[in-house]
Amino acid sequence: ECVTQLLKDTCFEGGDITTVFTPSAKYCQVVCTYHPRCLLFTFTAESPSEDPTRWFTCVLKDSVTETLPRVNRTAAISGYSFKQCSHQISACNKDIYVDLDMKGINYNSSVAKSAQECQERCTDDVHCHFFTYATRQFPSLEHRNICLLKHTQTGTPTRITKLDKVVSGFSLKSCALSNLGCHMNIFQHLAFSDVDVARVLTPDAFVCRTICTYHPNCLFFTFYTNVWKIESQRNVCLLKTSESGTPSSSTPQENTISGYSLLTCKRTLPEFCHSSFYHDTDFLGEELDIVAAKSHEACQKLCTNAVRCQFFTYTPAQASCNEGKGKCYLKLSSNGSPTKILHGRGGISGYTLRLCKMDNECTTKIKPRIVGGTASVRGEWPWQVTLHTTSPTQRHLCGGSIIGNQWILTAAHCFYGVESPKILRVYSGILNQSEIKEDTSFFGVQEIIIHDQYKMAESGYDIALLKLETTVNYTDSQRPICLPSKGDRNVIYTDCWVTGWGYRKLRDKIQNTLQKAKIPLVTNEECQKRYRGHKITHKMICAGYREGGKDACKGDSGGPLSCKHNEVWHLVGITSWGEGCAQRERPGVYTNVVEYVDWILEKTQAV
């Protein structure tokens, strides 16, 4: 169960793994998510009632029962990791913390014009984890505009103190914003020298590379394969660093593989999970449970669903015993990696998918699309719904998208004049409006949740949730679309489609067959130029051809702007407003869904 709410003035008792310093409870939650064992945390905010040495402490916790007793304590903020909130997982943190000095090892001190320049310097410096910048108002004249680049063993501050007129923040490497670039090459039969920052066991060099990418101090790695001459070093992944940031030397070495961290790549990070299966391989570790399972795929599902499980080994059934079910060993360790890897014993091993953004119904592959057509085929957009009103007569009102088994995301402006959810019907799995008859099954709407800052479509916050009276059973023709990940804010989507039954020109009628149009995204700067009389905010996203011709129109409102990225469809926008339809140099304006992910989660998870 994904729980994103933070519990104010609440402390979880016991279960401590370790204490780190974080500038906010929100960032404490991210640190907990990426820690191999952390399930819950307690953060202490600054408060006159609390000892200043405890301010900004983030206590990472674990519990066999996945929960801990709650105690009231002023200034304490507690919560759960995002390990089961697939679309929430992102290491990217663009927040700037005012009047906080995040302490670490200062290794570079220089003058910068602004905090943004300082953050860019940190992002483009291979060793930098975070920075502190003394602003123009800093009391010490000589220290004004000084940008301090910092690093630590853990990647988090060693301490955080209040300090007027400074700002601090983190490197944006994990937001794919570093200009350092990266080496994607894997070097066979080559070993790097330099300092080892950690040693873990991995089944292959690719898992080794992912672990290196997410380790705060790993810049490159060397992996010793399972046929390496020294038995005790087989499957060893050495995470490495150097002062220069690159290996100072390398040695040709049979059965070793070396490579680099992908943290500085100008693309989103590899997912913090390993989806492959390793045949004839046993992973050793602390045993969590032994369960019967039909296949190694089923075993991986069991591991993924058990939040404390980190990896597993499946031993297939011998002959026909136990109804053909094998044994599924769910395991964990202190660092998330096996304590030993054995070969030749017949097991099939793998890792939990709980930290993949892929572990979700919304990522299931759907039918291949018909390129070039404007009419959709059945099952092509299984998240698209048609929202009908029954008053005064039944008609199509707006589009919408399935985002959960009881939730539709749509536009707030669709509900102008709608007095009650009782008059609404949601039809899913529909291709043609003509399929909707008196006896066609639909979902009643229990609740309409409109964003409380919504006034009109043109001023933003044009977003609404419909809570359905019954749950949607996912099939090929009705299933959810993934919400965009906050970590993918910098992704440039190139395969975006708008769909709906709306008008095909300004004076028209609702279409019978679901229409689709591939439309390029337009930058907000470009969009602002086309709508001088409006404010195009970062909470809006625009799409359209300069010459016009393809666009959403009346009746498409509330429907999805769906973009495919890494083979997964994401709900990037909600059809909101525009000047006319498909006019030259008038792009369509959509609600920028990534900016509302927190709002969506807050509303859909409210108890």
Partner: antibody
């Protein structure tokens, strides 16, 4: 952990020059400024000068013409050079690490006696 | 150059007393003033920086206040181990400068 250690000649004849080395560990000289401060016997503290993380220097106005501060980042060493020494330069010489202009870590100091 | 003046070279106190040491700058130094404690045969130790921020591990009986040219360092309840020399220092503008020091002694 953070440490600073001064090493100097101990005794110098008048009109000679002085060279004191401050060797640091537990942090990098590229990220912190280092100060030199002296304290004559039974007297107060006198600020001599500093070298910033980026290599810039600042000196006490009265001593500027006789002072020179430099460093070797790779060796984690900071150097204080002072010429034309007089007996009133007899003092304990400290190096200290910068924290926004204050000095959060100090060395133990090295005693210099200027005497013939 | 900025001159820092500590008007009292000596101050007498008893354990448990509240004591305040003052320091005056010859020109405005904003809030960039630090306070140090020095015991015989030891290096100075940073207690307070930027007027009122306590350094790590410094007991909360030590506080600082002021801005501009007038600054005060206070020990709310003097302990035996607090008997030492206290220096103020401006870190507003180089060349940085120290006050002459105030020796806190037993009454």
């Amino acid at each position: 952990q953070v440490q600073l250690e001064e090493s100097g000649p101990g005794l110098v004849a008048p009109s000679q020059s002085l060279s004191i080395t401050c060797t640091v560990s537990g942090f990098s000289l590229t990220g912190y400024g280092i100060y030199w401060v002296r304290q004559p016997p039974g007297k107060g503290l006198e600020w001599l000068g500093m070298i910033w993380g980026d290599g810039r220097t600042d000196y006490n106005s009265a001593l500027k013409s006789r002072l020179s501060i430099s460093k070797d980042n790779s060796k984690s060493q900071v150097f204080l050079k002072m010429n034309s020494l007089q007996t009133d330069d007899t003092a304990r010489y400290y190096c200290a690490r910068d924290y926004y202009g204050s000095k959060d870590y100090w060395g133990q100091g090295t005693t210099l006696t200027v005497s013939s | 150059d900025i001159v820092m003046t500590q008007s009292h070279k000596f101050m007498s106190t008893s354990v448990g007393d509240r004591v305040s040491i003052t320091c005056k700058a010859s020109q405005d130094v904003s809030t960039a003033v630090a306070w140090y404690q020095q015991k015989p045969g030891q290096s100075p130790k940073l207690l307070i920086y930027l007027t009122s921020y306590r350094n790590t591990g410094v007991p909360d009986r030590f506080t600082g206040s002021g801005s501009g040219t007038d600054f005060t360092f206070t020990i709310s309840s003097v302990q035996a181990e607090d008997l030492a020399v206290y220096y103020c220092q401006q870190h507003y503008k180089t060349p940085y400068s120290f006050g002459g020091g105030t020796k806190l002694e037993r009454l």
